[in-house]
């Protein structure tokens, strides 16, 4: 594998200035997959810098990324999805730094959407539902979801619930009465595919009802 140092002492002898990270999204546009890379240092001068991916591709040896402001992007059907690809930062055809990456280990799901909360008076609970485009996908179908909610006044006091379905029940007794709550959800791959949390869904806001005391009951 040309371009690689041959031993452990030299293995990281690359230009740290050009360190980058990438994520993949499978079937993000019909059957097209995408790969997005960006430099970790936002101050890198990206003029004349290019990204290229080689290996673990169908029908082609290498593909070049398109540059969109400060990110580099490919949309293609040509990912083999098995084996490691070599992703390189290049200038004038010369590699500055490269990473071997298996695209199935850097998957970032699409954000969940249509989050809503319905109060069930009889059951004294809140039914949280949301949707995900991954239910329709053929590859990254199995996700773990992270539902986060907080009382609006408690800025950093988020409660988290992990679930694999798209429906969650919150018991009224576990929430403060007459309070405004914010809730949001994100997803991460959970079967074979590995990677990163999606972006958060748009937040949904709901108010809890006041406590209805039965006749004869006293306020505490």
């Amino acid at each position: 594998e040309s371009g690689y140092a041959q031993n452990g002492d030299l293995e990281d002898a690359e230009l740290d200035d050009y360190s980058f990270s990438c994520y993949s999204q499978l079937e993000v546009n019909g059957s097209q997959h995408s790969l997005t890379c960006a430099f970790e240092d936002p101050d890198v001068n990206t003029t004349n810098l290019e990204f290229e991916i080689c290996g673990a591709l169908v029908e082609v040896k290498c593909l070049s990324f398109r540059k969109l402001q400060e990110i580099y992007f490919i949309e293609t059907k040509k990912f083999l999805l098995i084996g490691k690809s070599n992703i390189c930062v290049k200038v004038g055809g010369k590699s500055l730094t490269c990473k071997k990456i298996d695209l199935t280990t850097i998957v970032k799901p699409e954000a969940p959407f249509d989050l809503s909360v319905i109060y069930r008076e009889g059951a004294n609970d809140f039914v949280v539902t949301f949707n995900t485009s991954h239910l329709q996908k053929k590859y990254v179908k199995v996700l773990m979801h992270d539902v986060a909610y907080r009382q609006e006044k408690d800025e950093n006091k988020w409660m988290h619930v992990n679930l694999s379905s798209t429906k969650l029940t919150l018991l009224q007794r576990n929430l403060q009465p007459e309070a405004m709550y914010e809730i949001k959800v994100r997803s991460i791959p959970d079967h074979y595919f590995k990677g990163f949390w999606s972006e958060w869904s748009p937040s949904y806001y709901f108010r809890t009802p006041e406590i209805n005391n039965s006749p004869g009951e006293m306020d505490p």
């Epitope: 594998e1 041959q6 293995e11 999805l81 098995i82 084996g83 490691k84 298996d102 590859y139 074979y192």
Partner: antibody, heavy 118, light 111 residues
């Protein structure tokens, strides 16, 4: 060229431990996970576990968990497999193998014979 | 654990003839078009050698008389025209789920 070179044959007594090494060369050590595969005499292949030299993260076959430890030394591009509480059934050839992708093995060491005998 | 069943256990084929080895898994090892099945060749006294990865992708340097096919739970390794140097034991392996398991092996000999 890409090579995995393993340490030499070992003879051990039941209850003892053995530590086998696998030195990688010809590629950037942290780019590929390295795994260990067991082959008992006249038998098939059995995956023991693997290690990611970049992070030191490991994955072990439940069957060997508690008895196997995999480590890596980036300074020498070497991975190690230690197997403890040896028994006669551990007599086998142990191969280290590079994972070209998740999880197939594109480069193999020459094998290390471990004999467990009282 | 996913159980890998290879058939036949052994196979005698004339030089130049086709050899076909099957591997059946106890559950699917495919995710849509991603087939997590691989094939190895092992000659006596040598380590295994990767032939096919992802069910049908030929490893670099492997002669194109070797081919793989299949999806789900049923996979096949084919040697289109058996050569003397192909005498070996062949193993299938799945990588969809830990522990990554191998078939019991198929011994290919010259008839």
């Amino acid at each position: 060229q890409v090579q995995l070179v393993q340490s030499g044959a070992e003879v051990k007594k039941p209850g003892a431990s053995v530590k086998v090494s696998c030195k990688a060369s010809g590629y950037r050590f942290t780019d590929y996970e390295l795994h260990w595969v067991k082959q008992a005499p006249g038998q098939g292949l059995e995956w023991i576990g693997g290690i990611d030299p970049k992070t030191g993260g490991t994955a072990y076959n439940q069957k060997f968990k508690g008895r196997v430890t995999m480590t890596s030394d980036r300074s020498t591009s070497t991975v190690y497999m230690e197997l403890s509480s040896l028994r006669s059934e551990d007599t086998a050839v142990y191969y280290c193998a590079r994972s070209g992708g998740r999880w197939y093995f594109d480069v193999w060491g020459q094998g290390t014979t471990v004999t467990v005998s009282s | 654990d996913i159980v890998m069943t290879q058939s036949p256990d052994s196979l005698a084929v004339s030089l130049g003839e086709r050899a076909t080895i099957n591997c059946r898994t106890s559950e699917s090892v495919s995710i849509h078009l991603l087939h997590l099945m691989h094939w190895y060749q092992q000659k006596p006294g040598q380590p295994p050698k990767l032939l096919i990865y992802g069910a049908s992708n030929l490893e670099s340097g492997v002669p194109d008389r070797f081919s793989g096919s299949g999806s789900g739970t049923d996979f096949t390794l084919t040697i289109s025209s058996l050569q003397a140097e192909d005498v070996a034991v062949y193993y299938c392996q799945q990588s969809i789920k830990d522990p990554y398991t191998f078939g019991g092996g198929t011994k290919v000999e010259i008839k």
